[in-house]
């Protein structure tokens, strides 16, 4: 039974606007038509789901309307963008990929991407 390797960058620095993007790439052992991608955040041994999307190969990645994630897919690569991040959101963001259909089912978990978020310094008041 083949394993499925998931690769993601080790470190990403969020922009000053609180946006972080990274690629989650999986080595598909089979010809999946339905794929589920989940992003989890691990901080202080606590794990929470950030967002998840199921998509059909060749179609757009669709997250829920209120999701902080957006993404696009291209072959076995998923380009993920997380928005609205603040310094307190710094943590390890884990990409989990599931090949849902057709059987057999495969699951792969990446090593995680450490996202660092630095809150921008407030602009100093100017005296005119």
């Amino acid at each position: 039974c083949k394993a499925m390797h998931v690769a993601q960058p080790a470190v990403v620095l969020a922009s000053s606007r609180g946006i972080a993007s990274f690629v989650c790439e999986y080595a598909s052992p089979g010809k999946a038509t339905e794929v589920r991608v989940t992003v989890l955040r691990q901080a202080d041994s606590q794990v929470t789901e950030v967002c998840a999307a199921t998509y059909m190969m060749g179609n757009e990645l669709t997250f829920l309307d209120d999701s902080i994630c957006t993404g696009t897919s291209s072959g076995n690569q998923v380009n993920l963008t997380i928005q609205g991040l603040r310094a307190m959101d710094t943590g390890l963001y884990i990409c989990k990929v599931e090949l849902m259909y057709p059987p057999p089912y495969y699951l792969g978990i990446g090593n995680g991407t450490q996202i660092y978020v630095i809150d921008p310094e407030p602009c100093p008041d100017s005296d005119f």
Epitope: A3, Q42, I109, G110, G112
Partner: nanobody, 115 residues
């Protein structure tokens, strides 16, 4: 190195119940997924169910209703409660552990359902 040791298999009559266990040891990431697969004679290895360290559970259609997966995170131990067993449940049951960037298999435990 991670090790998985399954136990609890054996010969059981149709309609009976069995509880499988899988003890994991070694370097295990705090986020992980543990699951059960089974392989019937001459067949491929199929997912039965899996459960993540944060409690998320997934069952294959064939396991819904009769099988219950659970885990003890403190002991890194996985369980599979199997009820109303049928002859077609006869298989080698394998434990699998997914950690960050890797996955591991146990050696398997044989379950035989026969009268």
């Amino acid at each position: 190195e991670v090790q998985l040791v399954e136990s609890g298999g054996g010969l059981i009559q149709p309609g009976g119940s069995l509880r499988l266990s899988c003890a994991a040891s070694g370097s295990i990431s705090s986020y992980n997924v543990m699951g059960w697969y089974r392989q019937a004679p001459g067949q491929g290895r199929d997912l039965v169910a899996h459960i993540a360290s944060n409690g998320e559970i997934m069952y294959a259609d064939s396991a819904k209703g009769r099988f219950t997966i659970s885990r003890d995170n403190a002991k890194n131990t996985l369980y599979l409660q199997m009820n109303s067993l049928r002859p077609e449940d006869t298989a080698v049951y394998y434990c699998k552990l997914w950690v960050l960037g890797n996955d591991y298999w146990g050696q398997g435990t044989l379950v035989t359902v026969s009268s």
